[in-house]
């Protein structure tokens, strides 16, 4: 390893600021690509990270292109991905980003899906359907014409699918209020069959939602297809047009036909032999982890390694797992001592208030990003609807029935099943299965056991005592857990299933179907109360409203959790209220939010994280 | 050791074209940004033009459209193209090496200059 | 672009004395400063990076300092090599741009 001529910063709780965001991503996995990032190094040496939301922080993060403010320009697509500076003042210790790049999770574009059955999984490119390779979303095996995708690699061996942004799911802005595009519509009197720029001079595509604009004014922006804009070519930036002809034979996704070099492509028209239109189809795109954790161990002292293996190598490849090799880990120790745990703790926020993770940059008309708010809940329009008809249907051979699916399996962030010894000290538990406030007092659980913690001194932690000792219904492995303030009714989710105790006496359990949740919902990552007897429901990703008198969903009130809880992780696999503020937890971490009481206001103000910081460290106290 | 040795510069008429050439040796030169620097007779050092490793191009405002610059890492060679040349285009010519290279931007200074070639423009 | 202002535009000093050069900046870049010394007919060699850090085998007496807008370069006793003409550049915006230079000549 090699260090910067010896810097490094002078103390350990080390703050950032996403300054802006590219629209490769969405924004809430862009959040939790750099909070990744950062925890690559606080796993191996005493440093924590702190979001804040303003300038003063340590490190500023940014994406840009070419001349972008600094002495370092940007060199378009590949070539230079990033560049940081060692640690100081000013821009020194700031981490830029190439947004001529495609970023990624390393495997290409990521496409968020709706409804389905895949409860918004992205797209996985290349997928199988019908034998046949996809590496962008296809109309093919429908009739209506909504784009779709697998989200496994092979749709003919496990029918997962979801919905692709698209026209006909949604609209973006303007003031149709997010429903979809209705075609044909009729604007100045013609009549158009697809998104249109007409009348505009941004360039952006835009369509009315109802079948005259003319005469109701009403319209929205169509969302923008990031599977298949083209690059390079000689239509940089449109769309690719499926099907399309090429030789005289039609193609229904991107190709490498005609070439030697293997690249796919696209035509941009329904005919290349007569068009000659065509781009590049987008590639894997760089690991915005990857390359962050790279640039954040510039940001923190760390210059190049000569280690082919090492993260700091000057090269980028793609790998999984975790990314440190001895040589990083050697070197950031060296800077800053070993060790994991926090020293000193993590830091006080910023005294500012929180600002939104990102001012807007135009007018409110324009779609700003490829990745919008979930699709309006089905009406009249025509949207799908996640029963049978929503489903690719090719036909004999097998259109996918949206049923009831397995909850996903465990990502390595999320809780193991191995047997708790009673014996075992929470500050060891590197995820819990669950944590809630339950009668004044913090309860973590984890495989069938569970601690109080109570918030004062003397010996503020008990346990563990045996769930099912204390509520005998329960399984050993929970998902979430909550107390209603009013009635002091503990709710517990485990997959599909609540229960829902009054004192000793349960009911339940009972299938989330009950709750008016359709079978993607495989599990309720947490509640928060909200007055007059309503509760934030959250799952992968969503939120709902929940009335917890009569205990069902309002299903017109789903929409994506950043859009009322800023900069958390879309993942959080457990939410809960602690001393009235909110808790999202994703892996060792939580993201605490102080948010208004309030909520799905018109003007949807959004609700911003203040702290970041470890379970065990921080709520748990553990030394 | 490291070496940069330009070449290539000579008289030439307003309006002509010359081809500058930079043979470097002695470090990696295909992960290194390239400058052309100038300086006029008895005057101060002016940046002309940088290409990336990526191949990537930046000029200053005096020569865009007129120059171009290139590498060929294989042959280790820095290139400036020079076009539709100006009598104030008359200057010594340097090579220089960044001091830094790839995404740590830190280390900022140039560590290698070569000896320079005069390029004149006169009638 | 940023305006790199040098003075003085001359400086006379004696071997053996103390010589600083000044180096302004239109605005902020940080310390993204670098300090070139040329003699008649030669290229431009680096002394200083990063507004305070020698070159490789820079002697001790040359010194840099500085951050923001205000850059020094201090050559703490005069040596008759160190006769020549200092340049100062910026990198903490695009484009790059030198200073029009001090010489320092012998009194």
């Known amino acids: 390893f090699q260090t910067f001529k010896g810097l490094k910063w002078d103390h350990h709780n080390i703050t950032y600021w996403i300054q802006n965001y590219s629209e490769d991503l969405p924004r809430d996995m862009i959040d939790d690509a750099f909070a990744r990032a950062f925890a690559v190094w606080g796993e191996v040496a005493p440093l924590t990270f702190t979001r804040v939301y303003g300038p003063e922080a340590d490190i500023v993060i940014q994406f840009g292109v070419a001349e972008h403010g600094d002495g370092y320009p940007f060199d378009g697509k590949d070539g230079l991905l990033a560049h940081a500076f060692p640690p100081g003042a000013g821009v020194q210790g700031d981490a830029h980003f190439d947004d001529d790049e495609l970023w990624s999770l390393g495997k290409g574009v990521v496409i968020p899906t709706y409804y389905g059955n895949s409860n918004g999984a992205p797209c996985h490119f290349p997928f199988t359907f019908e034998g046949r390779s996809y590496s962008a979303c296809t109309t093919d095996g429908r009739n209506d014409g909504t784009p779709w995708c697998s989200t496994t690699a092979d749709y003919d061996k496990d029918g997962k699918f979801g919905f692709c942004p698209s026209e006909r799911l949604y609209t973006e802005h303007g003031n149709g209020e997010g429903k979809p595009c209705v075609f044909p519509f009729i604007f100045e009197g013609r009549s158009y069959s697809a998104c249109t720029t007409k009348g505009r001079s941004d360039g952006y595509r835009w369509c009315a939602t109802t079948a005259n604009y003319d005469q109701d004014k009403l319209y929205g922006f169509c969302p923008t297809r990031v599977d298949a804009t083209v690059v390079g070519g000689n239509s940089a930036g449109e769309l690719c047009v499926f099907p399309f002809v090429f030789l005289g034979k039609q193609y229904s996704s991107c190709t490498s036909d005609g070439r030697r070099d293997g690249r796919l492509w696209c035509a941009t028209t329904s005919n290349f032999d007569t068009d000659k239109k065509w781009g590049f189809c987008p590639d894997q795109g760089y690991s915005l982890f990857l390359v962050a954790a790279h640039e954040f161990g510039h940001a923190l002292g760390l210059d190049h390694s000569s280690v082919p293996e090492a993260l700091m190598y000057p090269l980028y490849s793609y790998l999984e797992g975790f990314p440190l090799n001895k040589d990083d880990i050697d070197g950031i120790q060296y800077l800053y001592g070993r060790g994991s745990k926090p020293d000193p703790r993590p830091p006080a926020t910023t005294t500012t208030e929180p600002q939104p993770t990102a001012p807007p940059t135009m007018c409110p008309t324009i779609p700003p990003t490829a990745y919008p708010t979930v699709g309006p809940t089905v009406g009249p329009t025509g949207a799908p609807s996640p029963g049978p008809t929503s489903s690719p249907s090719p036909g004999p051979t097998g259109a996918p029935s949206p049923g009831p699916t397995a909850p996903p399996t465990a990502g390595s962030s999320e809780a193991s099943t191995e047997s708790l010894s009673p014996a075992d000290n929470p500050c060891n538990v590197d995820v819990f299965d669950a944590i809630a406030e339950i009668q004044g007092a913090l309860h973590f659980f984890k495989d069938g056991w569970y601690w109080k913690f109570l918030n004062h001194r003397g010996s503020p932690l008990q346990g563990p005592f045996l769930t099912a000792r204390t509520w005998p219904a329960l399984p050993a492995t929970l998902d979430s857990a909550f107390e209603d303030p009013q009635t002091k009714r503990v709710f517990f989710f485990s997959g599909r299933q609540m229960w829902v105790y009054t004192g000793k006496t349960v009911l339940g359990p009972r299938s989330l179907d009950k709750l008016g949740l359709g079978p993607e919902v495989t599990h309720v990552s947490g509640l928060l109360p909200r007055r007059l007897g309503k509760a934030l429901l959250f799952s992968k990703g969503r939120v709902w409203r929940f009335d917890l008198k009569s205990q069902k969903v309002d299903p017109q009130s789903v929409i994506r959790v950043d859009k009322e809880f800023s900069g958390v992780p879309w993942n959080s696999h457990d939410i809960f209220q602690y001393q009235d503020k909110a808790y999202f937890c994703h892996g060792k971490f939580f993201w605490r939010v102080s948010f208004q009481n309030e909520v799905n206001k018109v003007d949807h103000e959004v609700n911003q994280v203040d702290d970041v910081g470890y379970v065990t460290y921080d709520l748990l106290q553990c030394p | 050791e490291v070496q940069l040795l330009e070449s290539g510069g000579g008289l030439v008429q307003p309006g002509g074209s010359l081809r500058l050439s930079c043979a470097a040796s002695g470090f990696t030169f295909s992960q290194y940004d390239m400058w052309w620097v100038r300086q006029a007779p008895g005057k101060g050092l002016e940046w002309v033009s940088v290409i990336y490793p990526s191949g990537t191009t930046f000029y200053a405002d005096s020569v865009k459209g007129r120059f171009t610059i290139s590498r060929d890492n294989s042959k280790n060679t820095l290139y400036l193209q020079m076009n539709s040349l100006r009598a104030e285009d008359t200057a010594v010519y340097y090579c220089?090496?960044?001091?830094?290279?790839?995404?740590?931007?830190?280390?900022?200074?140039?560590?290698?200059w070569g000896q320079g070639t005069l390029v004149t423009v006169s009638s | 672009d940023i305006q790199m202002t040098q003075s003085p535009a001359t400086l006379s000093l004696s071997p053996g004395e103390r010589a600083t050069l000044s180096c302004r900046a239109s605005?902020?870049?940080?310390?993204?400063l670098a300090w070139y010394q040329q003699k008649p007919g030669q290229a431009p060699r680096l002394l200083i990076y990063?507004?305070?850090y020698r070159a490789t085998g820079i002697p001790a007496r040359f010194s840099g300092s500085g951050s923001g807008t205000d850059f020094t370069l201090t050559i703490s006793s005069l040596e008759p090599e160190d006769y020549a003409v200092y340049y100062c550049q910026q990198r903490g915006n695009w484009p790059i741009t030198f200073g029009q230079g001090t010489r320092l000549e012998i009194k």
């Open positions: 605005q902020s870049i940080s310390s993204f």
């Open positions: 220089a090496k960044d001091r830094a290279y790839g995404d740590y931007v830190g280390w900022n200074g140039f560590d290698y």
């Open positions: 990063d507004a305070s």
